[in-house]
């Protein structure tokens, strides 16, 4: 039985050209985390494997940095980075837990007047 829950930063906004940390946290389970995948829609951004460490996809290697922790840092943001991001926790023996984050990348002048982090 899957008892765990994923906590995320929810809906967040950031400035174009800036950076943002995508963060998820798995709680309420004793399952072992074997791997965490970070995906944007159907595109793989990065993998953190418990045995083999961090792996950044080739198309994102210049502007994605691992961490902090099992989180992911996106750099040099563009408006095209706006969208849904998913943290997929592969665990044993529970199975897979998925968290969702919505990122909105705003033009600098707009972002300055809006809330930086908005968690519903």
């Amino acid at each position: 039985m899957m008892t765990g829950t994923i906590e995320t930063t929810g809906n967040i906004s950031a400035e174009k050209g800036g950076s943002i940390i995508l963060q998820c946290h798995l709680s309420s389970t004793t399952a072992q985390v074997t791997q965490v995948n970070w995906e944007q829609q159907d595109q793989l951004l990065a993998i953190c494997n418990a045995d083999l460490g961090w792996h950044i996809s080739p198309s994102f290697k210049d502007r994605v940095a691992p961490g902090p922790g099992l989180g992911l840092t996106l750099q040099s943001l563009t408006v095209n980075d706006t969208g849904e991001y998913f943290c997929i926790y592969h665990t044993y023996p529970d199975g897979t837990y998925t968290g969702r984050i919505f990122l909105e990348v705003l033009e600098s002048s707009v972002a300055e007047h809006g809330a930086r982090f908005q968690i519903p």
């Epitope: 793989l44 993998i47 792996h55 996809s57 080739p58």
Partner: antibody, heavy 123, light 109 residues
Framework: QLQLQESGPGLVKPSETLSLTCTVS??????????WGWIRQPPGKGLEWIGS???????YYNPSLKSRVTISVDTSKNQFSLKLSSVTAADTAVYYC???????????????WGQGTMVTVSS | EIVLTQSPGTLSLSPGERATLSCRAS???????LAWYQQKPGQAPRLLIY???SRATGIPDRFSGSGSGTDFTLTISRLEPEDFAVYYC??????????FGGGTKVEIK
């Protein structure tokens, strides 16, 4: 479709270094989800995994061979290579390269293989 | 390391018969990490089953895999002439390292 092809000398002298290259065609070695591995098979015997590498250079090796093995990658040529030092007759085998799905979790396996190349260690 | 013991070493059967191949691990293996391969003389191994029970692309449904923990099975429901070959199981853990079983030869009776 994705294909792998091994190349290198078929004969290596004892105590020397065995060097093989695997060329990937029909797809890019720069895959976010896959490692690329080497497996060998002595004549008439079973399969033994040697080690695997990620496009960015991360590796993991069979502990029993680790002290003698170096696997490297050249993304510009879509190739990865194996070096095995201080070889003996016991290293005589067919050497295969294969795509390693260690990061695909539920699909962990070697799903695509090269045809193999026979390497004999003899003086 | 995890030792995979395959049995029997050789299985002598006729076309049309059912083949049951066993793979026993020296310690528990996640079923997600257990694969089966077929190898014919002079050829590279071919992936048949991954995740203990999922057929790889293009593999006929007469091949099926099952099992969990330390005991896994490959079943060929009705042997075709092209199925006579050597079959290997493999566990794909990182620590301890991945290993192959010693193989089972399925030969024509």
């Amino acid at each position: 479709q994705l294909q792998l092809q091994e190349s290198g000398p078929g004969l290596v002298k004892p105590s020397e270094t065995l060097s093989l290259t695997c060329t990937v065609s029909g797809g890019s070695i720069e895959s976010g989800s896959y490692y690329w591995g080497w497996i060998r098979q002595p004549p008439g015997k079973g399969l033994e995994w040697i080690g695997s590498i990620y496009y960015s250079g991360g590796t993991y090796y069979n502990p029993s061979l680790k002290s003698r093995v170096t696997i490297s990658v050249d993304t510009s040529k879509n190739q990865f290579s194996l070096k095995l030092s201080s070889v003996t007759a016991a290293d005589t085998a067919v050497y295969y390269c294969a795509r390693d799905g260690v990061l695909t979790l539920n699909k962990r396996s070697f799903d695509i293989w090269g045809q193999g190349t026979m390497v004999t260690v003899s003086s | 390391e995890i030792v995979l013991t395959q049995s029997p070493g050789t299985l002598s059967l006729s076309p049309g018969e059912r083949a049951t191949l066993s793979c026993r691990a020296s310690q528990s293996v996640s079923s997600s990490y257990l694969a089966w391969y077929q190898q014919k003389p002079g050829q590279a191994p071919r992936l048949l089953i991954y995740g203990a029970s999922s057929r790889a692309t293009g593999i006929p449904d007469r091949f099926s895999g099952s099992g969990s923990g330390t005991d896994f099975t490959l079943t060929i429901s009705r042997l075709e002439p092209e199925d006579f070959a050597v079959y290997y199981c493999q566990q794909h853990t990182v620590r301890p390292p991945l290993t192959f079983g010693g193989g089972t030869k399925v030969e024509i009776k």
